[in-house]
């Protein structure tokens, strides 16, 4: 094959590469750019910046060599449009830094950085502690701060990722009110801080205020929908990223629903309930107290974690005509109560039969140590018992 | 225990250049970054590059590029500052002073040389 | 380049005196040293990354801050501490140092 004369030649099947001397100051247009999974840059003095848009479209690019180049600086979002590279090699340029939000979200095999004349501050904390995990072959190279020395002898202990406090009213919250949260943001190098509120959607009316170092968030007009959701607060300084949630309790009367009962491994009376604070929950059984045994209990089921209603069944283990009847389920928290009844028939009573029916008569005795935890029909002037065959 | 030892004073000429030495000793030389920086008289002190003696890499204040040069010699474990065309504003002490990277900072300092450009 | 800026310039004090110096960087710093230096000598360490002595240094030395504002303070002035301080920094390239604060005896 005749050599190639262009700046950059094709390498395999999918592969790039741009060695010709100072052929590139940049890395648009490159060709067959979208299928590229590997593109290898060498003696490029002039490639001194490498920016969101010079890797648009290398969607599929997996390794990614710029070496021996001018490469000076990797702008932080660099490779946002290269979710998939796993290998990066920098070596041998111009690069005195290199930020943690460049690499955030990649899953890099491989980073190489040596020849690089680094600048050790707090803003490289990240790759030292790549360094000490031993992650991306980053020990191996044994990087070298310029002027200063070893990257793993710089001092971190003032490297610390900014340090969120969110305050919160003391008081309740009811619905409809307007709750003031305030995040107080510490550390140095603060860069960017802002709120996360994606959970929130129609629980109230955001308005934000405020700035570096204390942040503002008004919820206006709540609702109780904004229980169990997440109000975050977050801020960045050059060695990484720190979040904190909170959650804003908006207090509501409870609520109850019941629903017909329906035959699981046990019976089972399924029910809602809802309120903030969480009611405190009571069963009556034909309008009297149901004390609850390990054969009648009350189950709840994982609740979700972003919201306040609570599921769960009364559950009956293998229920006789006994316990048919009228279930009530009481639910009370300090701003008001609800109850909710509901039929439960679980199987019909075996003594209401037709005189001319015939009598299933079992002759064996009465066992009387019977653990089954099945009601026993017991009829003293009988020396015969009279069993019930329950399905 | 770690010395650095600077060569005498020296008087030029505007235009001139000079070299002034810096000897190490207590320590292996080739380990740690040599810098150097200067003090002009009733003034504070300026950075004017930095050596790696282990394998002359250099780096210089955007101020002194094109007019300083950093050499060493390993073998009398000596570094060099050579500035040239000189002039007056150059007058000053300069020092050359280790960068101790277990501890991360310019621990010794040579005892200064002076130099006086003066016509 | 980072600018450091020292306060006072200068200061006159007492033997026994309590004594505060500043040093503000025109922007976020990770760490700070602090040197002192006497006539026709060179510069001796006295704090490393913004709050470790450096070795032989009295405890009356102290050194605080983050970001951009950083604080020397002698508890209990000596004689030998009348001298000259200076602030340096070396977040990035190159290393600046402050203008100095000349500590006179009053």
């Known amino acids: 094959a005749a050599p190639c004369p262009d700046a950059c030649c094709p390498h395999g099947s999918s592969g790039l590469r741009c060695t010709r001397d100072g052929a590139l100051d940049s890395l648009h247009h490159l060709p067959g750019a979208e299928n590229l999974t590997e593109l290898y840059i060498e003696n490029q003095q002039h490639l001194q910046h490498l920016e969101l848009r010079d890797l648009r479209g290398l969607g599929e690019l997996r390794n990614l060599t710029i070496v021996k180049s001018g490469l000076r600086f990797v702008a932080p979002d660099a490779f946002h449009f290269t979710p998939r590279l796993s290998r990066l090699n920098l070596s041998f340029n111009a690069l005195e830094s290199l930020s943690w939000k460049t690499v955030q979200g990649l899953s890099l095999q491989e980073l190489v950085l040596s020849g690089n004349p680094l600048h050790c501050s707090c803003a490289l904390r990240w790759l030292q502690r790549w360094e000490e995990e031993g992650l991306g072959g980053v020990p191996e190279q044994k990087l070298q701060c310029h002027g200063q020395g070893p990257l793993a002898h710089m001092p971190n202990a003032s490297c610390g990722v900014p340090t969120l406090k969110v305050q919160v009213p003391n008081a309740s919250v009811d619905v409809g009110d307007d709750v003031l949260l305030r995040c107080q943001v510490e550390g140095r190098g603060l860069e960017q801080a802002g709120w996360i509120l994606t959970e929130l959607e129609q629980s109230a009316t955001v308005m934000k205020s405020g700035g570096l170092p204390s942040l503002g968030l008004t919820l206006a007009n709540v609702t109780s929908d904004l229980n169990r959701k997440n109000v975050t607060c977050w801020a960045e300084n050059d060695v990484g990223r720190a979040e904190v949630s909170v959650q804003v309790n908006v207090s509501f009367p409870a609520s109850v629903q019941l629903h017909t009962a329906v035959e699981m491994h046990h019976w089972c009376i399924p029910f809602s309930v809802d309120g903030q604070p969480a009611p405190s929950l009571r069963w009556l059984f034909n309008g009297s107290v149901l004390n609850e045994t390990s054969f009648i209990f009350t189950e709840f089921l994982e609740p979700a974690a972003n919201e306040t209603v609570r599921h769960g069944c009364l559950r009956l283990n293998q229920p006789t005509h006994v316990n048919n009847g009228n279930y009530t389920l009481l639910a009370a928290n300090p701003f008001g109560q609800a109850s909710a009844s509901i039929m439960a028939a679980f199987m019909d009573n075996p003594f209401e039969f037709n005189p001319e029916d015939p009598i299933p008569v079992s002759f064996s005795p009465v066992d009387t140590n019977s653990t089954s935890g099945d009601p026993v029909e017991k009829k003293d002037e009988t020396p015969f018992g009279v069993s019930v065959a329950v399905g | 225990q770690v010395q650095l030892v600077q060569s005498g004073a020296e008087v030029k000429k505007p235009g001139a250049s000079v070299k002034v030495s810096c000897k190490a000793s207590g320590y292996t030389f080739t380990e740690y970054w040599m810098h150097w920086v200067r003090q002009a008289p009733g003034q504070g002190l300026e950075w004017i590059g930095t050596i790696y003696p282990g394998n002359s890499d250099t780096s210089y204040a955007q101020k002194f590029q094109g007019r300083v040069t950093l050499t060493r010699d390993t073998s009398t474990s000596t570094a060099y500052m050579e500035l040239s065309s000189l002039r007056s504003e150059d007058t000053a002490v300069y020092y050359c002073t280790r960068f101790y990277f277990e501890d991360w900072y310019f621990d010794v300092w040579g005892q200064g040389t002076t130099v006086t450009v003066s016509s | 380049d980072i600018q450091m800026t020292q306060s006072p310039s200068s200061l006159s004090a007492s033997v026994g005196d309590r004594v505060t110096i500043t040093c503000r960087a025109s922007s976020s710093i990770s760490w700070l040293y602090w040197f002192q230096q006497k006539p026709g000598k060179a510069p001796k360490p006295l704090i490393y990354?913004?709050?470790t002595l450096g070795s032989g240094v009295p405890s009356r030395f102290s050194g605080s801050g983050s970001g951009t504002d950083y604080t020397l303070t002698i508890s209990s002035l000596q004689p030998e501490d009348f001298a000259t301080y200076y602030c340096?920094?070396?977040?990035?390239?190159?290393?600046?140092f402050g203008g100095g604060t000349k500590v006179e005896i009053k």
């Open positions: 340096q920094q070396w977040h990035s390239y190159p290393p600046t």
């Open positions: 990354y913004t709050s």
